[in-house]
């Protein structure tokens, strides 16, 4: 089959939350944080009750999908991460539940989730080449890498 | 910390069948994908196919579909692979390793003799 | 399937040489991953998403590369790196590995 790209014939059906209410901390120690409604950031906290906590939903697809396909929630909300484009911020989006299907532009809800170990990475499946990232004084976007963070450890059991 | 137990040798007769094992601990075992992987004496490694063991949705090289079942058992966290009709080709270390390829079996070495 | 050639099959180096070994993939992939294998051992995750070491792996190796070009280095050589390495994709299904290249110590 053909390396992933944006395919908007493929449709992706939500099939189950697979991780709840988790804390991403980015390679600094930083925590992923709400900087306003629309935005994320990271910083080092002391308290971790700070920290977003996040629910991923696993999603598949009809072409055999070489990677776990997810979408990431804020916990207790109907806020879903959303791409845009390299070096945007990505996005809050309020829908009223999780999506049963998604395919053409809505791909940008979803992201491909591999783990490395104890590190995470999500790259978009709308942009495959783009990972979710921190940045320095900047808010959470997309990125190809350095000099942005595209690595997270998952913190489980925080609640 | 994420461990994947293989026994070290399985020995068997051609024609025969043998299923393989792999005990996973450490982590919550239907959240990820297991893969299993082949490799002959002297020889390189060989995906033999994939299977999500929370709803047993398994895909397959088209190489081994019709010789390789991959199962699991949710109760016990093991994923198991069977060979079928085995002839001297089989005869390989093979390996189970988590999704992300981050975390491997010792593998079970698979003698296939009469 | 995407076809993933390694060159070359067989190499040597002197301790403190400098080392490039290469993965051709037969169509182009996002990422390229790379396993380290020594004899009765299983693979070891080496290098992932084509440039980030895996855990313990020392600084002296990279990896570069895109589309359907990639290389691992070993910026000087030493004496626990002889090993056959592997090249994977999983950019595709299904996964695929390389032949593998084997290094050796001169």
């Known amino acids: 089959s053909a390396p992933f790209s944006f395919l908007s014939n493929v449709k992706y059906n939500f099939m189950r939350i697979i991780k709840y209410e988790f804390i991403l901390n980015d390679a600094l120690n930083q925590s992923i944080i709400r900087a306003n409604d629309q935005y994320l950031t990271a910083a080092a906290l002391h308290n971790l009750d700070e920290a977003v906590k996040f629910d991923m939903g696993a999603y598949k697809s009809s072409k055999d999908d070489a990677k776990i396909t997810v979408i990431l929630r804020i916990s207790k909300t109907q806020l879903y991460v959303t791409a845009q484009d390299e070096d945007q911020p990505v996005l809050l989006k309020e829908m009223p539940e999780i999506p049963k299907t998604i395919t053409g532009s809505e791909t940008n809800l979803l992201f491909f989730w591999e783990t490395h170990g104890t590190k995470n990475y999500f790259t978009s499946v709308a942009h495959p080449n783009l990972f979710i990232a921190t940045k320095q004084d900047y808010w959470v976007c997309l990125a190809g890498g350095p000099p942005s963070i595209t690595d997270f450890q998952i913190l489980e059991n925080q609640a | 910390q994420v461990q994947l137990q293989q026994p070290g040798a399985e020995l068997v007769r051609p024609g025969a069948s043998v299923k393989l094992s792999c005990k996973a601990s450490?982590?919550?075992?239907?959240?990820?994908?297991m893969n299993w992987v082949k490799q002959r004496p002297e020889q390189g490694l060989e995906w033999i196919g994939r299977?999500?063991?929370?709803?047993?949705?398994?895909l397959y090289s088209q190489k081994f579909k019709d010789t390789a079942i991959l199962t699991v058992d949710k109760s016990s966290s093991t994923a198991y692979m069977q060979l079928s009709s085995l002839t001297s080709e089989d005869s390989a270390v093979y390996y189970c390793?988590?999704?992300?390829?981050?975390?491997w079996g010792q593998g079970t070495t698979l003698t296939v003799s009469s | 399937q995407i076809v993933l050639t390694q060159s070359p099959a067989l190499m040597s180096a002197s301790p403190g040489e400098k080392v490039t070994m290469t993965c051709s993939a037969s169509?182009?992939?996002?990422?390229m991953y790379w396993y380290q294998q020594k004899p009765r051992s299983s693979p070891k995750p080496w290098i992932y998403?084509?440039?980030n070491l895996a855990s313990g792996v020392p600084a002296r190796f990279s990896g570069s590369g895109s589309g359907t070009s990639y290389s691992l280095t070993i910026s000087s050589m030493e004496a626990e790196d002889a090993a056959t390495y592997y090249c994977?994709?999983?950019?595709?299904?299904?996964?695929?590995f390389g032949g593998g290249t084997k290094l050796e110590m001169k």
């Open positions: 390793a988590r999704y992300g390829f981050d975390y």
């Open positions: 450490g982590y919550t075992f239907t959240t990820y994908w």
């Open positions: 299977i999500d063991p929370y709803d047993s949705e398994t």
């Open positions: 169509s182009s992939v996002n990422y």
């Open positions: 998403l084509t440039s």
């Open positions: 994977q994709q999983w950019n595709s299904n299904p996964y695929t």
